[in-house]
Amino acid sequence: EKLPKAPVITTPLETVDALVEEVATFMCAVESYPQPEISWTRNKILIKLFDTRYSIRENGQLLTILSVEDSDDGIYCCIANNGVGGAVESCGALQVKMKPKITRPPINVKIIEGLKAVLPCTTMGNPKPSVSWIKGDNALRENSRIAVLESGSLRIHNVQKEDAGQYRCVAKNSLGTAYSKLVKLEVEVFARILRAPESHNVTFGSFVTLRCTAIGIPVPTISWIENGNAVSSGSIQESVKDRVIDSRLQLFITKPGLYTCIATNKHGEKFSTAKAAATVSIAEWSKSQKDSQGYCAQYRGEVCDAVLAKDALVFFNTSYRDPEDAQELLIHTAWNELKAVSPLCRPAAEALLCNHLFQECSPGVVPTPMPICREYCLAVKELFCAKEWQAMEGKAHRGLYRSGMHLLPVPECSKLPSMHRDPTACTRLPYLDYKKENITTFPSITSSRPSADIPNLPASTSSFAVSPAYSMT
């Protein structure tokens, strides 16, 4: 007959390393008499015998986790008790190891040159994987611009064209290596003009070729603007090579002009644009007239469309960079200011401003603008818009104001030619001829000149006269 013997654990538990989905076994060999009852705990919580994830063999001396999960990590203890002496315990750790796994792989990226690009690469694993990157077939070297972040992501500051290519991240630990799929980094470059068109001074009727070269990723498109509008005549030839677009505009020159090359490319929903301009001048024009640099062309704007005569030629001043655009912008601004004036003044002022900014033009060898006749200018100032002008007297700025705030591009009446001196040297305002007939009340403004200076103005209805010395300042 055997003597009772308290349990002794002859094989203490050891630390067990196991990969996810692998088998993990703890052994707790016990010597005792009678045979002990052996129970197992994980993190001090009893493991139930009927839990199918576990196998308990050899009277409890072998505990096996049949398929290890992340959550099985912890401290496992066996407790042996046979009623003789005290219970004995031995503990060991289960360290769940994990081959590297890329949980957030990098994705294809399009980025604009000069910006910052981040390619994600989030990993899991135990031991914690180290992350490196491959570009093309070579290991990517970190530098002042390129860094692998703690998270594993690749950060590229100030992205350059040469950063474009195929990338993949590599996660590595002692248990293995994981590779992401190849992803593409595309570097987009804002449109940039490499070769601007050159200005030309040519004779009337010459052919001129303007050349504009631009680069960008994606390859830009090139459009041409003539004096602020789309080119209406001429032929365009384009060629593309190695992300460079070359555009040639051939023109038959009958008038001077400002030609703008506009290179545009698209980056997602946004566009980038680069511009370069060249002037084409006609030699005889510039020689014979230094003061009046400009050209005659049909008015193609919107603001004065209803005011100016249909198909009339108007003068565009080439001292502006984009004459047609610039003059249209001036009139547009003035138009907004006129919203504040009286219904009597407004149409008259509009007629004055449109005809002043877009003066009638005689083409000839030297394009000559025809100013408004002084009498019509004074009619607007002292008749139709007297109240508005009076309110502005004493101000330091020249022009019509709204609330004393905004300047309007109005002529200085006294400096304009009189229709009595040379009726062909100035422009009449037909609107005023028609409207003045219907005016029944006028502002009381004292003047030293007879009313006869205002064309066809009935003397009985006017209480003011025109003073040639009256300036608009």
Partner: antibody, heavy 121, light 107 residues
Framework: EVQLVESGGGLVKPGGSLRLSCAAS????????MDWVRQAPGKGLEWVSS????????YYADSVRGRFTISRDNAKNSLYLQMNSLRAEDTAVYYC??????????????WGQGTLVTVSS | DIQMTQSPSSLSASVGDRVTITCRAS??????VNWYQQKPGKAPKLLIY???TLQSGVPSRFSGSGSGTDFTLTISSLQPEDFATYYC?????????FGQGTKLEIK
Amino acid sequence: EVQLVESGGGLVKPGGSLRLSCAASGFTFSSYTMDWVRQAPGKGLEWVSSIGSNGDYIYYADSVRGRFTISRDNAKNSLYLQMNSLRAEDTAVYYCARGQLAVAGTHFDYWGQGTLVTVSS
Amino acid sequence: DIQMTQSPSSLSASVGDRVTITCRASQKVNKYVNWYQQKPGKAPKLLIYAASTLQSGVPSRFSGSGSGTDFTLTISSLQPEDFATYYCQQSYSPLSTFGQGTKLEIK
């Protein structure tokens, strides 16, 4: 002296059944895990099934699970393997073996002489 | 299941040679590996258990080593009676598995 003697082998048609027995002697049968291991002609060893000392746990190889049943009778010092739905690939010499717990897992320290099972039509 | 891969599958050697057979587990199995010898028409015989412990009655020219996934059985000086087939086995999982065997033949 420890002895394990298998019996019950023979020729059986595919789909048929057979019951193997293993008589143990020379040791306290009820204290040991017992296993069945088989060996197809000219092939290697293949573990088949295992049963705990008091029948508290039972395991099967994937290839036999659902068709074979292991059991023991500690009073008779006997181990059994009930084989149903037999297939040609079950043809083998079947050994019973005693499992011995050591400092690192169990090992088979004693084996029977084996019994041949032939499944053929 | 845990796979056990033995190499080589066959080996020719002469009496007195030192022979090494290796066994690799598909996952860590601690030291829960045993080695058996089998001669034609006979039951297998336990040589080594727990990776390196010599079974009682087995000659000391047999030795085992290894832990984790890689294990070796070494016969320091081959004797005529050692020509047989050798198997490794893991008992780390309750679903035990054997290696495919290494046949040791006389050169």
